[in-house]
């Protein structure tokens, strides 16, 4: 289902998108992800805020928690204990970084319909979760981990050394949260809740980024974050496991780091429980081309964790970094020793492999000039995964099932032909034992979420079809969208072009390039969106193009690793190449071409504007990186190595925006940044502005006081209004 297109007879009733539509979120869509609690039951928060339990087999629904109870503590979120005796209610949500937040938690006893009194939880809590079985609670408060055997019991304190900005237990520090895990938690229950594993991050030696937060006070506050920039001292990580049944008996036991990893700076990348007495840890060298997966077993006699060298599996990249954006995680099979994992095959495409003893003897499960993206679930007889194989469009995602019980394994695409026009980009959510699953389709048509039988793949019901959105779009002149490819010098450049509703190839249109272009990213995706660029095409008559160049993902290692140790070169070249090809198509006004991007996209748009090609009349950089020496170690060094003389300092210096200050003289440049950006620090734009001033180059700038990397709230409206004025002025479009 595609939203209705323009027909001449309807032209009077149809209207273009307005900027107001976008800023009000008028055309936003809903998705439905069941909160699975068994093979055939799930919870969902209804529109009126009741917590409802659905039983798929009987078709019955039950309100297990009323909106009245939710409202009594102003709860915005909930979590049912696995034994279904208690529910935690979360309120006073206070955002910290990308994933982290603090909140107040109340425990509601379903048995008597009352809140648990006595031994209440402290506030605010940094993270809280139930054990996978029963109703034990683990939580993090003031950087320390606590355990409760039952919600009403007094807590047992597991760690004591937690200290703000110094030692983090059970939660990540800034860089692990953003660039490595990436989660708000760093603790993991074993499958039956016998053990609790957790990470301790020591940030004592990490340099601190400090910035002003202006607030309303007479004196601004200073925000201090231990933030390792490229080449700086990194957090020191240790992993511990504690027996939660007798936590005081031997206390937390440290899991040993593989010798080949411990010999120099390293990272912990993930922890996967296999059984209650077997755990799998993944480690990564600071130079991120070597990863080690280590399987450890509990030694009952010594009460310690043993990680034999024979259970160490090494993953190494000779052409780039290990993994895609992150090193993939293993999905263990029922024998509790073999596992499935996505990594590069000999042809340089990421595929599913089955590892039984050594990585060298891995059995390749999928293959082809496409990539396996995610393993959703492994059951006794099936493996469910997503890939971009179907019809050779890298920007699509379909869900496949491989039968692993039979030989040779047979493969079936579950989603390819379900709603072919409407749905080409899926994710999935599986119940226990994959008895049922939900499919969430993100486009290119209006998103739809459906429920399916895990054995037959039969659709059972529609969970969310966005009917209101469909009706609201009936009288809107939406732009047309095309996804195509350019073949240039043995490189395939996929692009998405967004065209005005009455597009006419014989006319000339202004062109706006929207770029992200970061390593292992993908912008050209078959997804639905009604956003700012939709408005620019619909109302302002612009053509907008997104191009996936070298360094982008899911098209093989040759394209992905092309940017290794050389950020800021090929990404920019490929945007420029694409623009030249677009001009050749004949409908672009080459005197009216602009480029804009945010974050990494702001870096690329800045470099493109300063490329000296004369292609771009103007451009915008929102919260750009300006020098890789200013950005986080974990991210930057993955792609650039270290900023040292004997490593890659030269390219760190060559790839700054500041080095090209002179080249901004002949373009209109709008530079935008939030002053409280914890991620890409305001320092980046401050340095660009300083270099432009020193070169006596005119430019426009806007800062957003106390705003972070997301520029949210009222700033969003101001931002898009401001950028719209800038582009309309650049393209000589009347207001």
């Amino acid at each position: 289902l595609r939203p209705s297109r323009v027909h001449n007879s309807e032209e009077n009733t149809m209207r273009a998108l307005t900027l107001k539509d976008i800023l009000n979120g008028t055309f936003s869509y809903k998705t439905f992800f069941p909160n699975w609690i068994s093979g055939q039951e799930y919870l969902h928060q209804s529109a009126d805020n009741n917590i409802v339990l659905y039983n798929i087999e009987t078709g019955q629904s039950y309100t297990i928690l009323s909106n009245r109870t939710m409202k009594s503590v102003n709860a915005s979120n909930y979590g049912l204990s696995p034994d279904r005796q208690f529910v935690y209610l979360e309120s006073d949500y206070s955002k910290l970084w990308r994933y982290s937040y603090t909140a107040t938690y109340y425990i509601y006893d379903l048995s008597n319909g009352e809140f648990v009194r006595g031994n209440e939880l402290p506030r605010p809590i940094q993270y809280l979760c139930w054990s996978p079985v029963g109703s034990k609670l683990a939580y993090v408060y003031q950087n320390n981990i606590y355990l409760k055997q039952r919600p009403g019991d007094p807590p047992f304190q597991i760690t004591f050394n937690g200290r703000e900005n110094k030692i983090f237990n059970g939660i990540p520090d800034w860089v692990y949260e953003e660039e490595m895990l990436p989660t708000k938690y760093a603790l993991w229950w074993s499958p039956n809740g016998k053990f609790l594993a957790y990470a301790e991050f020591n940030d004592k030696d990490i340099p601190v980024i400090a910035y002003s937060y202006y607030g309303d006070e007479q004196y601004p506050r200073t925000i201090n974050i231990p933030y390792p920039k490229a080449g700086a001292k990194n957090p020191v990580v240790r992993i511990f496991i504690i027996d939660t049944t007798y936590p005081a008996y031997v206390g937390p036991q440290e899991v040993p780091v593989p010798a080949m990893i411990a010999s120099s700076d390293y990272y912990f990348s993930w922890l996967t429980w296999v059984t209650d007495e077997r755990v799998c840890l993944q480690w990564l060298k600071r130079v991120q081309n070597v990863s080690v997966l280590s399987i450890c077993d509990f030694r009952e006699d010594w009460q310690t964790w043993d990680c034999p060298k024979t259970q160490e599996h090494i993953e190494e990249s000779r052409t780039g970094w290990a993994g895609g954006f992150f090193v993939s995680r293993p999905v263990f099979s029922y024998d509790a020793i073999s596992y499935y994992k996505i990594f590069s095959d000999k042809d340089g495409y990421k595929h599913i492999h089955y590892i039984k003893d050594t990585v060298e003897n891995a059995i390749q499960i999928t293959s082809g000039k496409w990539e396996a993206i995610n393993i959703f679930r492994v059951t006794q007889d099936s493996l469910f995964y997503s890939s971009n194989e179907f019809e050779e469009y890298p920007g699509r995602r379909n869900i496949y099932r491989i039968s692993i019980g039979s030989y040779p394994p047979s493969k079936k695409c579950v989603t390819c032909h379900l709603r072919k026009e409407r749905c080409q980009y899926y994710t999935a959510s599986f119940s226990d034992y994959a008895k049922y699953y939900a499919l969430v389709c993100y486009g290119p048509g209006i998103p739809i979420s459906t429920l399916h039988d895990g054995r037959t793949d039969q659709e059972i019901k529609i969970l969310e079809e966005n009917k209101e959105l469909e009706n609201a779009l009936k009288n809107i002149q939406l732009p047309k969208e095309e996804i195509k490819k350019l073949e240039v010098d043995e490189i395939t450049l996929w692009y998405k072009m967004i065209l005005p509703p009455q597009f006419d190839r014989s006319k000339k249109y202004p062109l706006l390039i929207q770029v992200y272009g970061g390593p292992c990213s993908q912008s050209v995706r078959s997804v639905f969106a009604v956003n700012w660029i939709s408005y620019l095409a619909s109302k302002e008559g612009m053509v907008i193009a997104l191009v996936d160049g070298r360094g982008t993902a899911f098209q093989g290692d040759k394209l992905l690793y092309a940017v290794y140790r050389k950020l800021g070169v090929y990404e920019v070249e490929d945007q420029i190449t694409a623009v030249r090809k677009f001009i050749e198509m004949g409908f672009i006004d080459e005197k009216r071409i602009a480029i804009w991007g945010w974050s990494y996209g702001g870096y690329v748009s800045s470099l493109a504007l300063a490329s000296g090609t004369g292609l771009f009349k103007c451009g915008i950089a929102v919260a750009p990186v300006s020098s890789w020496e200013y950005y986080a170690s974990v991210y930057t060094e993955r792609f650039m190595g270290l900023p040292t003389k004997d490593d890659n300092l030269e390219h760190y210096k060559n790839s700054t925006v500041m080095a090209r200050a002179e080249y901004f003289r002949n373009v209109d440049y709008l530079l935008i940044h939030g002053t409280a950006d914890d991620n890409v620090h305001f320092q980046n734009s401050a340095q660009i502005a300083k270099a432009l001033v020193n070169a006596q180059v005119d430019f426009q700038a806007m800062w957003y006081s106390d705003q972070n990397h997301g520029l949210s709230g009222l700033s969003t409206n101001h931002l898009y209004t401001h950028m719209t004025h800038f582009l309309k002025q650049c393209f000589s479009l009347s207001d």
């Epitope: 055939q40 039951e41 019955q60 034994d83 048995s111």
Partner: nanobody
């Protein structure tokens, strides 16, 4: 171990009422969650209502406001009062018990069962 025996079923007109009873043996009745399930011909057995040891109740949304579950721990009995009965309420009604939470809607999660009592709603 708990034994359960239902009573009170029968034929009732649409719009009518019925009170089902379930008598339980065993001294620890008060510590069990109790539930009423029903099974119509050719259909899955479904939870209609449940009551926890602490007295909180759970109802299927399509019987909420019409059915009331209650328990009398002194008499080791659980009741299901059904008002405004409809033809689609026709089924065999079963009493079930389990230790722990009442908030389980799959019949396999309830280990103890009565024999069932037929309820027919028809004019």
């Amino acid at each position: 171990q708990v034994q359960l025996q239902e009573s009170g079923g029968g034929l009732v007109q649409p719009g009518g009422s019925l009170r089902l009873s379930c008598a339980a043996s065993g001294r620890t009745f008060g510590s069990y969650a109790m539930g009423w399930f029903r099974q119509a011909a050719g259909k899955e057995r479904e939870l209609v209502a449940a009551i926890s040891a602490g007295g909180s109740t759970l109802y299927a949304d399509n019987v909420k406001g019409r059915f009331t579950i209650s328990r009398d721990n002194a008499r080791n009995t659980v009741y299901l009062l059904s008002n405004s009965l409809k033809p689609e309420d026709t089924a065999v009604y079963y009493c079930a018990a389990r230790r722990g939470s009442a908030y389980y809607t799959n019949h396999i999660d309830w280990p103890y069962w009565g024999q069932g009592t037929q309820v027919t709603v028809s004019s």
